[in-house]
Every structure is written in structure tokens, then in C-alpha cells.
Interface confidence: low
Amino acid sequence: SAPGEDEECGRVRDFVAKLANNTHQHVFDDLRGSVSLSWVGDSTGVILVLTTFHVPLVIMTFGQSKLYRSEDYGKNFKDITDLINNTFIRTEFGMAIGPENSGKVVLTAEVSGGSRGGRIFRSSDFAKNFVQTDLPFHPLTQMMYSPQNSDYLLALSTENGLWVSKNFGGKWEEIHKAVCLAKWGSDNTIFFTTYANGSCKADLGALELWRTSDLGKSFKTIGVKIYSFGLGGRFLFASVMADKDTTRRIHVSTDQGDTWSMAQLPSVGQEQFYSILAANDDMVFMHVDEPGDTGFGTIFTSDDRGIVYSKSLDRHLYTTTGGETDFTNVTSLRGVYITSVLSEDNSIQTMITFDQGGRWTHLRKPENSECDATAKNKNECSLHIHASYSISQKLNVPMAPLSEPNAVGIVIAHGSVGDAISVMVPDVYISDDGGYSWTKMLEGPHYYTILDSGGIIVAIEHSSRPINVIKFSTDEGQCWQTYTFTRDPIYFTGLASEPGARSMNISIWGFTESFLTSQWVSYTIDFKDILERNCEEKDYTIWLAHSTDPEDYEDGCILGYKEQFLRLRKSSVCQNGRDYVVTKQPSICLCSLEDFLCDFGYYRPENDSKCVEQPELKGHDLEFCLYGREEHLTTNGYRKIPGDKCQGGVNPVREVKDLKKKCTSNFLSPEKQNSKSN
């Protein structure tokens, strides 16, 4: 039988009455245009909604926008457009919400053509009040807050000037001209690229990378011949043009650009690209595009310095610069990532790693599913997940995979079961163990969200017809109840719940259409009365993450340690609550070969834990560049996985000797850097 329709599914008692008392409708007095929604702060209940509508007139487009505020998680909204003097707000800049719980908001207004500069509205009290400020420039980008100090803002102007404010946008100063890209680093540092000749595009590959650590009083050039740069974890990356040709290489710095090392990655040509797929303070996943318009490349994983890389996955699907990749960090379980590969026959298959890129496998076939027409063998196939690429191809996939750090082990995604991703209408699958096992959760495409740290899952069917039914589950997707939230169906446009999955409120957004008009409408449903009581100790059970063989002493060991979690029992219908903290008990494991990646010049044959020398490097000295000096590597082929905490056990030899020789490649060496003050 279909999920949720077998005899074992107990109904939640009196849920219709409980939900009806907690369903709040708000009709927005707006013509349907576009709507954007932002949460202001964490656990504040404050939501800002900006609606915009363009009226095409004969000579020009006249726009109007309205701003609404809720302070009860979307149950009620108040029109606060008068606080911004009924000004038309530019949606392409969105609402710039300050970091953490600063309560800061910046809205960028539309101004008439001849004005000297732009205009912003600023609030530092969770949008209770706004101050209008006229800018001395026209902004090109949204205001960017410093992660360390929300009073510090930076923005680029349409004239390519870099502007900084130290008092939350009250006063602005242009600290540099001819700027292409600017980013906040740590400790209020700003990194930016500049062009010398004509424009960012014309100077691509000849840009300079600059740094200021004092908001523009002084500067240091930390790189030349730059194509682009990026920040990930504690790493600063720059792709740098080679001296002799049009290829470029990645250089990496862990000291804010004072010293650079060349990453041991292939160089790329004009049509290729590098992409940082994921980065933390331990390591980096880097995609390197294949030559030619193949649509795939190779994933490499770094060591703890971001310098030495190991090949992690071949034929990784990534469709051109800024294109689509399915690479997904499963945030509900440490070490788990999902992505897609393009196989030789051009079909797309999903792969999963449980050990941060050490080994990739197919997803196990769900117990309650048949193999589809893509499968050669009807009894042997895998689950394939739809993510960004499928969405970009306009497949019937309304949402990417979903996981939340505080809903331990839960992953929800659209998928198909066969030898490859199918273009047929997908179903929704759930894993409760971080991707090891999967179950079909819902027939057909749905929108879904996680509430109360996994205590409730909510779903709405994806349909082009108006809808008025929401589905919810209190047992991690095993059984489903349906609730009709309105008599009059609406054209559904989105589910909104507070980021972090701690809330018990869900907002259903859509529009109503009658003969002459259409209006935005939201329904906010509070599930607090469904989960009547707070969870107690007896509601939780001990769960060993990454467990595949309970008989094995090392069962659950991933990246050198195992973790036991307290998980809510599926049968318990209770509130985790807003203050819920994931309880976990780590224990260190003995080192095995699984705790080591293959070192530079080595690789792991399929289904083997031993690293063997790359044939083309056999007998060669292993030399690489570090901080512009040549190093000699003595290794028996292994290096510890960054972040791996294992102790004892296997201990392969690894030694790096300084050859005291200069590297001959094009480095961002200290002598190529200079400083200046304003």
C-alpha cells in the first residue's frame, strides 16, 4: 500500500479542530506581481514581506511596492509602507537583513533617472522604524554586512567604486575605484579585485587582488594576474593566469593573502572553470572542469592546508561556469554529501559519500519501490536524486533535497528508482539515517519542509491547479494526515517556515484569481496543539550514526570517531521545542586506512582501501610548491583526512622536506606584493 495508507497508521486525535483554531489567513491588498519574504532575526517571529507590481504604461513602467510586517511568525501582517514613505523598493536587491540577531534591515529604493545617487531605508529595530538615507552613489549590488560588525557595510556602485560605511549606512566613503568584486573576510577585512585598463571584463586575468584590514585607510596588493577569487572556510583562493599562455591555476592562502601556495590541481584553459563546492575550516571540495563542453569535471578534496588534493570523484556533473551542479551537503549527518555524475552513455546518476569524499557509492534502492524503465535488471537498481540540474531542466521537481542540522539523519528529496535519473514524474523519498537507507514517502512531486527539529514534516502537492490541502506527518514521513486549510483553493507559490527548522509555524503562500483581479494570500498554520506536550526523556532513543554493522567494534566510525545521538522516537507525538539542542556522545576510533586519503601522486583503485602510486609518477620524485618554495614529499601514499580524529592503529609515514629551491611557476610570491595607505 502507499505510504501512510496502511493499518498501522494511527491518526492524530482531533487534529482538524486543533489546526482550524490555529490557521490564520491574511489577504494582501495587492495586485499580484512578485513577493519576497525575509525573516528578521532568529526566534523573533518578525517577518518582512515586500510585494511589487509593475504597471506597464505607454512611455514607461510604473512600479509600486508595499511592505508588510509580522511579529507573530506570519499570523498577522501590518502594512508599514508608510514607514518607507510609500517608496518603490528595488526587488533585485532584496531585503538586506543583518547578521545574527542585530535587527538590522536595509531596503534599496528605486530613484528617478537624473538623481545624484541612490536611496536606502535603514532599520536597526527589527523593522519597527526606518530612516531614509540618500546615497552619494548608485548601488550596483546589495549592501553587504561585515560578519563581525553589523554596523560596517560595503557596496559596489554602478561606476565600479567600492563604498564603505562604518555607521550602518548613515555615512558612506568611496575607498577605491575600478573595483570588480568585493567580499568581507574575517576580522572586518575586505578583499577586492581591481582593473587597470578598461573594465572588469577586459582585464579578466589581469586583475589585481587587494586587501584592506582597516576599512580603507591602508591597502595591500596581495595578488596580480588574477582571474577571480573566492573565500571558503579559512581558505582564500585565487585563480591566476600563467605567464606563458592562457591557462590559469588555483593558488591558496591561509593567512589572508600574505603568503600563497599553488594548489596541486590541474590548470584550466579559457573555457574551463574551477568551483569551490564546499569548504569548512578543515578542507575544501574543489570541482575542476574538463576541457571542452563536456558538462562534467572532477571533484578533488584538499588536505588541511588546501594545497595537496586527492581525486575524489570523476565525471562530476557541472554544466558550465555558473551553471548547475547537484552537489549537496547533507547537513543532518556529518561527512555526507550527495551529487550527480554523467556516465559514459550520457545518463545521470546520483552518488553519495559518507566520509567527506573518501569514497562514493550509489544510493541504496528503497525497500518499497520498484526499478523503473531505466533499469537493465528489474531487481537491481539505485535511487537517483533530483536536485539543481533537474530543476534547471524544467523537470517536474519543485524542490531541491532538504536536510537540517537539528533534524538528525533526515534527508528528503525527489527521486527516481532505476539505473539513472528518469525524466518521468518523480516521487518524494526520505532517509532517516543520513542517506544510508531510503523509503518512498509521497507519490508524485511535492513541496516539503521540516518543523520542530523533525517532529513534524509538512508537504503540499505540486500542481498547476489551485490547492487547499496540506499534508503533515509526526513520524518522519511514515504516516500522513491531510488538512483542508481553506474552502477556496489558491494557486500555491511557496511554503515558508523560519530558517533553522525549530518553528512549529508554516506559511502557505499563494494567490487567488477572480475574473478581474488576483491577490496575494497567506495561510499560517501553527502545529503547537498537534504536538500537545513537551518531549520527555522516554520519548528519545539512542541512535548510532553511520552504523552499518553492529557486530563490528568499529561500527559507526567515520572520520576517526563515532557519534551516538538521542533521537525522537517515531511513535512519540510531542514538542522538541524551540530550545531543543541535539544531544550527541562522540567516541574516538582507532586509525585504519579508511582514515587516510591518498597522498599527492597516489590513487585508490575501485573497491580497495590501499593507495597505489599513479603509473605516470612511478619512480619520479614527488615535489610540489609551498609558499613559493619547492618541497620534497616522502610518503607511502597516505595522508590523514582533514578533520579526522582517529588515534592509534595504522600510522603511515609522511614527511615533507624543504628543498630550499624557488618554484619556477607563476606565484603570488611576497615580492610581487606591495602596500599603500590612503
Epitope: N396, P398, V423, Y491
Partner: antibody, heavy 129, light 107 residues
Framework: QVQLVQSGAEVKKPGASVKVSCKAS????????MSWVRQAPGQGLEWMGI????????SYAQKFQGRVTMTRDTSTSTVYMELSSLRSEDTAVYYC??????????????????????WGQGTTVTVSS | EIVMTQSPATLSVSPGERATLSCRAS??????LAWYQQKPGQAPRLLIY???TRATGIPARFSGSGSGTEFTLTISSLQSEDFAVYYC?????????FGGGTKVEIK
């Protein structure tokens, strides 16, 4: 009112290129996609590709890949379709059609397929030696 | 690509009668389907989108139904201005594809 006005008829020799324009008026040019569809004499409709006027991104039918280029000029609210290496079988009427359900369309329409709701009058392209 | 097959190729109907046109997709297109009407020398005109929703200004005698792979356009009572060629089109998966068309002629 919303309308699409296309450039006039063209006669081309095999191997040449043709560039057809389509000027939009009466709506926000960047708020939907624009498809190009052709119809050979006495035949049915054939979709060639689509362009997003907002960002200029395109998607072409495999059959025309490498021969067709769709561009736009937001300052004049005009989209262009250029077809190169013309052959006699490219003789057809070429239509531009607004396709408001493109992914970048503003507002709720982007979730559903709303059809090609406004069409240009068509441009006849004749390829003959 | 998804192949759209329309039947019949020609339908002869008397004015005032009901006309039923079929469109079949080679794989599911959900409800991402539109119907168009085209008269000689004119551009196509959108009749139905989302498989069943009438476009602005389209008379109530036109109705669409179906989802997945089987779709129907029904003209409840044919008027003289309804004699034309009708095309279905899917937008479930690129490239968008049209059916071969059904010509509705006067009996």
C-alpha cells in the same frame, strides 16, 4: 495593449544567414521568456528555442543547436533570432511568442505553464538559389 | 524529446455540433500542456493552458481536460469561426514540442 511586431519578409541564398527581430510593447519586457517557433509551408509548428530577456540566457532545440542564436536588446525591448547556414528546408514563417512561464518570470506564474500567450505576426523567410 | 500525437488529423463536423480533439504525449507531461488555434495566414492563438484553463478572452465553448499523457480539447458547439487547425504543445521537458495538428473542417 501587449503586442509583438516582427521585421519584414526576407529572401536569402543557401548558406547565408538571416536575422529576424521582434519588438515587444505593452508589458515589462524582462518579465517573461520569448520563444521562437517556425512553420514550413503546409506544415505544423516547430519550436526552435527560448530566450530570457532579463538575463539573456537561452535554450535551443537540439535540431538548431550551433545554427541559431537568440539575443535581446533591453533598451529597445527587442529580441533577435539569427539562423545561419540556411538551406532550402529553412523556408518557413518564423514567429516570436511571449512565454510568460519562464523560470525568471516575476510572480507566481513562474511555477506553471501559461502557454505562449502573445504571438508576433510572423516573418516569411524564403531560401532559394 | 517528448513526441505529441494528435488525432484525428482531420475532423469533419457540422456547425452547432460538438468536436472532440485528442492529444497523446509519449511520456507524462503532467498538466504542462497548451492548445492553440490557427487560421490560414494568421499566427497561432492560445486557447487553453495548464491543460484545462481557458486563456483570456476565449469563449466558454472551448474546454480542455486530461493530465499525464492523454488530453482532450472539446468545442461544445462549433461556430463558423471555429473551423481552423488546432495544435497541442507540451512544456514539461525541453524542447517544447507540438502535435502535428488537427484540422477541423465543415461537414
Amino acid at each position: 495593449q501587449v503586442q509583438l511586431v516582427q521585421s519584414g519578409a526576407e529572401v536569402k541564398k543557401p548558406g547565408a544567414s538571416v536575422k529576424v527581430s521582434c519588438k515587444a510593447s505593452g508589458y515589462t519586457f524582462t518579465s517573461g521568456y520569448m520563444s521562437w517557433v517556425r512553420q514550413a509551408p503546409g506544415q505544423g509548428l516547430e519550436w526552435m528555442g527560448i530566450i530570457n530577456p532579463y538575463g539573456g540566457t537561452t535554450s535551443y532545440a537540439q535540431k538548431f543547436q550551433g545554427r541559431v542564436t537568440m539575443t535581446r536588446d533591453t533598451s529597445t525591448s527587442t529580441v533577435y533570432m539569427e539562423l545561419s547556414s540556411l538551406r532550402s528546408e529553412d523556408t518557413a514563417v518564423y514567429y516570436c511568442a511571449r512565454d510568460p512561464s519562464g523560470i525568471a518570470a516575476a510572480g507566481p506564474a513562474s511555477r506553471y505553464y501559461y502557454g505562449m500567450d502573445v504571438w508576433g505576426q510572423g516573418t516569411t523567410v524564403t531560401v532559394s538559389s | 524529446e517528448i513526441v505529441m500525437t494528435q488525432s484525428p488529423a482531420t475532423l469533419s463536423v457540422s456547425p452547432g455540433e460538438r468536436a472532440t480533439l485528442s492529444c497523446r504525449a509519449s511520456q507524462s507531461v503532467s498538466s504542462n500542456l497548451a492548445w492553440y488555434q490557427q487560421k490560414p495566414g494568421q499566427a497561432p492563438r492560445l486557447l487553453i493552458y495548464g491543460a484545462s484553463t481557458r486563456a483570456t478572452g476565449i469563449p466558454a465553448r472551448f474546454s480542455g481536460s486530461g493530465s499525464g499523457t492523454e488530453f482532450t480539447l472539446t468545442i461544445s458547439s462549433l461556430q463558423s469561426e471555429d473551423f481552423a487547425v488546432y495544435y497541442c504543445q507540451q512544456a514539461r521537458l525541453g524542447p517544447w514540442t507540438f502535435g502535428g495538428g488537427t484540422k477541423v473542417e465543415i461537414k
